[in-house]
């Protein structure tokens, strides 16, 4: 029997390598049964997760799952770090695993990864 609890499908220890200056969408896949929960994003600062208030977010609905998306337009160097999404469901707070963004600053060509490094790095298939 499928659980009717809200479930947030971010993998533990997941990582994304992205380029500063590019647009990027960070997805929080959300499974729920009836009413869509209120979902927020926060960014980890040590052990506390600071809520991201004035950031562009959107929902994308698919057949069996919904995605709460945090938009980076564009990615900035200080977007580097770990993020977590949280859902309020029946007065319970459900937290996802954190996912880490590694931002490469394209201004410094010497910091750009080589082709070999790129092959072994988590470049997104977006």
């Amino acid at each position: 029997k499928e659980s009717c609890d809200v479930q947030l499908y971010i993998k533990r220890q997941s990582e994304h390598s992205i380029l500063a200056g590019d647009p990027f969408e960070l997805e929080c896949p959300v499974k729920y049964c009836a009413n869509r929960p209120h979902v927020t994003w926060c960014k980890l600062n040590g052990t506390t997760c600071v809520k991201l208030e004035d950031r562009q977010t959107s929902w994308k609905e698919e057949k069996n799952i919904s995605f709460f998306i945090l938009h980076f337009e564009p990615v900035l160097p200080n977007d580097n770090g770990s993020y977590r999404c949280s859902a309020n469901f029946q007065s319970n707070l459900i937290e996802s695993h954190s996912t880490t963004l590694y931002v490469t600053d394209v201004k410094s060509a010497s910091e750009r990864p080589s082709k070999d490094e790129m092959a072994s790095r988590p470049w997104l298939l977006y």
Epitope: K11, Q13, S14, E15, R121, L124
Partner: antibody
Framework: EVQLVESGGGLVQPGRSLRLSCTTS????????IHWFRQAPGKGLEWVGR????????KYTASFKGRATISADGSKSIAYLQMNSLKTEDTAVYYC????????????WGQGTLVTVSS | DIVMTQSPDSLAVSLGERATINCKSS???????????LNWLQQKPGQSPKRLIY???KLDSGVPDRFSGSGSGTDFTLTISSLQAEDLAVYYC?????????FGQGTKLEIK
């Protein structure tokens, strides 16, 4: 039925390369991390590294970095371990395993494939 | 790297008796999400390993309830409450809190 089947093992000469495959079925590979482990004859288990088939991210044990490449084809539900510059001490049974990435709900192992490095 | 040390290296226990295997890590396995990613594997002779226990104490589906796991921080225990003949195996603890993931050296469980 869940299955992980490793293939590609066998006898290989020192200095050569080998690509092992791990064919999976019965679950969505993109919901998991694919790990490769190895076990030398009569010895314990060693983690080689892991791949996230959803985005290609890989992690390795330091001793395998630069010599091993783990990849996955999510559309075919197959993962790979490419090992270069093989040495006699790489002789081992190599296992792939698939661990659910969100809630640890399962951890499946393949039956293993024996790689023998010898001249 | 985190060093995982199991004790004893081998253990002989009579059928129906309790078997206890210990695992100690060189640093805490408590992750920042508040969970502890310590697993126990069973490897029977000539077979591939099988996950028995994850998150210290959660039994994998189909694992008999005579198996249990406990512990926190750096000290963990696998207990078999009443040893059965089919429990003859090597048992490994492994941690996937910190990269690189590491294993204990294994404990060989034999029937006395």
């Amino acid at each position: 039925e869940v299955q992980l089947v490793e293939s590609g093992g066998g006898l290989v000469q020192p200095g050569r390369s080998l690509r092992l495959s791990c064919t999976t079925s019965g679950f969505n590979i993109k919901d998991t991390y694919i790990h490769w482990f190895r076990q030398a004859p009569g010895k314990g288990l060693e983690w080689v590294g892991r791949n996230d088939p959803a985005n290609g991210n890989t992690k390795y044990t330091a001793s395998f970095k630069g010599r091993a490449t783990i990849s996955a084809d999510g559309s075919k539900s197959i993962a790979y371990l490419q090992m270069n510059s093989l040495k006699t001490e790489d002789t081992a049974v190599y296992y792939c395993a698939s661990y659910e990435g969100y809630y640890e709900r399962f951890g499946y192992w393949g039956q293993g494939t024996l790689v023998t490095v010898s001249s | 790297d985190i060093v995982m040390t199991q004790s004893p290296d081998s253990l002989a226990v009579s059928l129906g008796e309790r078997a206890t295997i210990n695992c100690k890590s060189s640093q805490s396995l408590l992750d920042r999400d508040g969970k502890t990613y310590l697993n126990w594997l069973q490897q029977k002779p000539g077979q591939s390993p099988k996950r028995l226990i994850y998150l210290v104490s959660k039994l994998d589906s189909g694992v008999p309830d005579r198996f249990s796991g406990s512990g926190s921080g750096t000290d963990f225990t696998l207990t078999i409450s009443s040893l059965q003949a089919e429990d003859l195996a090597v048992y490994y603890c492994w941690q996937d809190t910190h990269f690189p993931y590491t294993f204990g050296q294994g404990t060989k469980l034999e029937i006395k």
